[in-house]
Interface confidence: low
């Protein structure tokens, strides 16, 4: 929801966080801002206290309950506020209907590991981390490596259209430092976008054998 | 105390438009989403469409390319509008909201206003 | 959409007796409501979220029921409880609502 030179966004993890960040222009730094989420349908409502993350923006989490628990569904509609404290009262500076399962954006796949590793190729696996059990195999994965010399910028994205979570790395250089990182998206959702990068993963491919390329 | 009166309906021509009303009075249309439910005569209640607190909709997909649910929060009225009516539209149409959270149900009815559509 | 499937369509008892009316989802839903309707009236609420009675119910009104398959049920019918009942499911949009029950006095 955009008023003015306002802007509020918000993310549904698909389990029990709404990240949002609002940022305006010209706005005091100094004032007290917070997000109020009222579900339509549920017996609960929550605030977060927003905190700046730049000149212009601030951001905040609500916790909506256990980080596994299923707090909303596709039929929800959780109006989104942001007040601002003006001396003794309260005034809004932004609101938008949010449809969780409309504005998705999982965590980051957690639990990185090598399976197995050999002079060219690499096999590695992960875990989605609080993913709703209503997505079944609807999701999708991006992988990149990040080769010697290279920036994770410039390297190549591997897309997995379907709920795989390993990978098996090919043409890989032997005896070289790799590191890996993954991210996931579910299929579902107007605006969903793309979870952060997991955490690197480092490994290092075996050395060629001697008179041997294995 | 809760009230919700609809206005607009009346006979309406094959292929006109309709606008009904439904001005809400004890509670403010920025904090509860309206919904609209219609019946054909002595027929069951049908869904139609909802206008959420800050102003979003959800439609029935059978009627989304002809219904427009609107409102003005400063009249604290909600308006439905739905063209290319054809006879099979005729019914009394209802707005309606939920209690506190929708869990509670339709709650609070219209009285309802009856939409004629015959030439 | 999820159809809703009233069974049955209409039914005539006595003053007192029970009164049993089913609702069958055509795929599993969360939240069953239970309406009123008296002829020429809007529709009253009755049972929210499953089993919860609607504020100012009589409490010979009662409902059941999970994932497909849902009950109505009024204990001790009275002749004021001449109406037709639907059911509502709250699960997915388009929301929908049972063909109705009408229920008659012997």
């Known amino acids: 929801a955009v008023n003015g030179t306002s802007r509020f966004t918000c993310f549904y993890n698909s389990r029990a966080n709404i990240s949002c960040v609002w940022s305006q222009d010209g706005a005091l730094q100094d004032t007290s801002c917070q997000v109020h989420a009222w579900p339509d349908r549920r017996r609960w409502n929550q605030t977060c206290e927003l905190l700046p993350v730049s000149q212009a923006s601030w951001a905040c989490n609500l916790i909506l309950g256990t980080p596994d628990s299923q707090k909303l569904t596709a039929v929800d509609i959780v109006t989104l506020r942001v007040m601002c404290r003006e001396g003794v009262r309260w005034r809004m500076m932004a609101i938008q209907d949010f449809k969780p399962f409309e504005n998705l954006r999982l965590m980051a796949p957690i639990s990185l590991q090598v399976v197995h590793v050999e002079t060219h190729r690499c096999n590695i696996s992960w875990k989605i981390s609080q993913a709703s059990h209503y997505f079944e195999r609807h999701l999708e994965f991006e992988a990149r490596t990040l080769s010697p010399g290279h920036t994770w910028e410039e390297a190549p994205l591997m897309t997995l259209k379907q709920k795989q979570e390993w990978i098996c790395l090919e043409t890989l250089t032997p005896d070289t430092q790799y590191e890996f990182q993954v991210r996931v998206k579910p299929l579902q959702g107007e605006f969903t976008t793309w979870s952060p990068w997991s955490q690197p993963l480092a490994f290092r491919t075996k050395p060629a054998a001697l008179g041997k390329d294995t | 105390e809760v009230q919700l009166l609809e206005s607009g309906g009346g006979l309406v021509q094959p292929g006109g438009s309709l606008r009904l009303s439904c001005a809400a009075s004890g509670f403010s249309v920025t904090s509860y989403g309206v919904h609209w439910i219609r019946q054909a005569p002595g027929k069951g209640l049908e869904w139609l469409g909802v206008i959420w607190s800050g102003g979003s909709t959800d439609y029935n997909a059978a009627f989304i390319s002809r219904l427009t649910i609107s409102k003005d929060n400063s009249k604290n009225t909600v308006y439905f509008q739905m063209n290319s009516l054809r006879a099979e539209d005729t019914a009394v149409y209802y707005c309606?909201?939920?209690?506190?959270?929708?869990?509670?149900?339709?709650?609070?009815w219209g009285q309802g206003t009856l939409v004629t559509v015959s030439s | 959409d999820i159809q809703m499937t009233q069974s049955p369509s209409s039914l005539s008892a006595s003053v007192g007796d029970r009164v049993t009316i089913t609702c069958q989802a055509s795929s599993s839903v969360s939240f069953m409501y239970w309406y009123q309707q008296r002829p020429g009236k809007a529709p009253r609420l009755l049972i929210y979220?499953?089993?919860n009675l609607a504020s100012g119910v009589p409490s010979r009104f009662s409902g059941s029921g999970s994932g497909t398959s849902y009950t109505f049920t009024i204990s001790s019918l009275q002749p004021e409880d001449i109406a037709t009942y639907y059911c509502?499911?709250?699960?997915?949009?388009?929301?929908?609502f049972g063909q109705g029950t009408k229920v008659e006095i012997k």
């Open positions: 979220d499953t089993s």
């Open positions: 509502q499911q709250w699960s997915t949009y388009p929301l929908t």
């Open positions: 309606a909201r939920a209690g506190d959270y929708n869990y509670d149900g339709f709650a609070y």
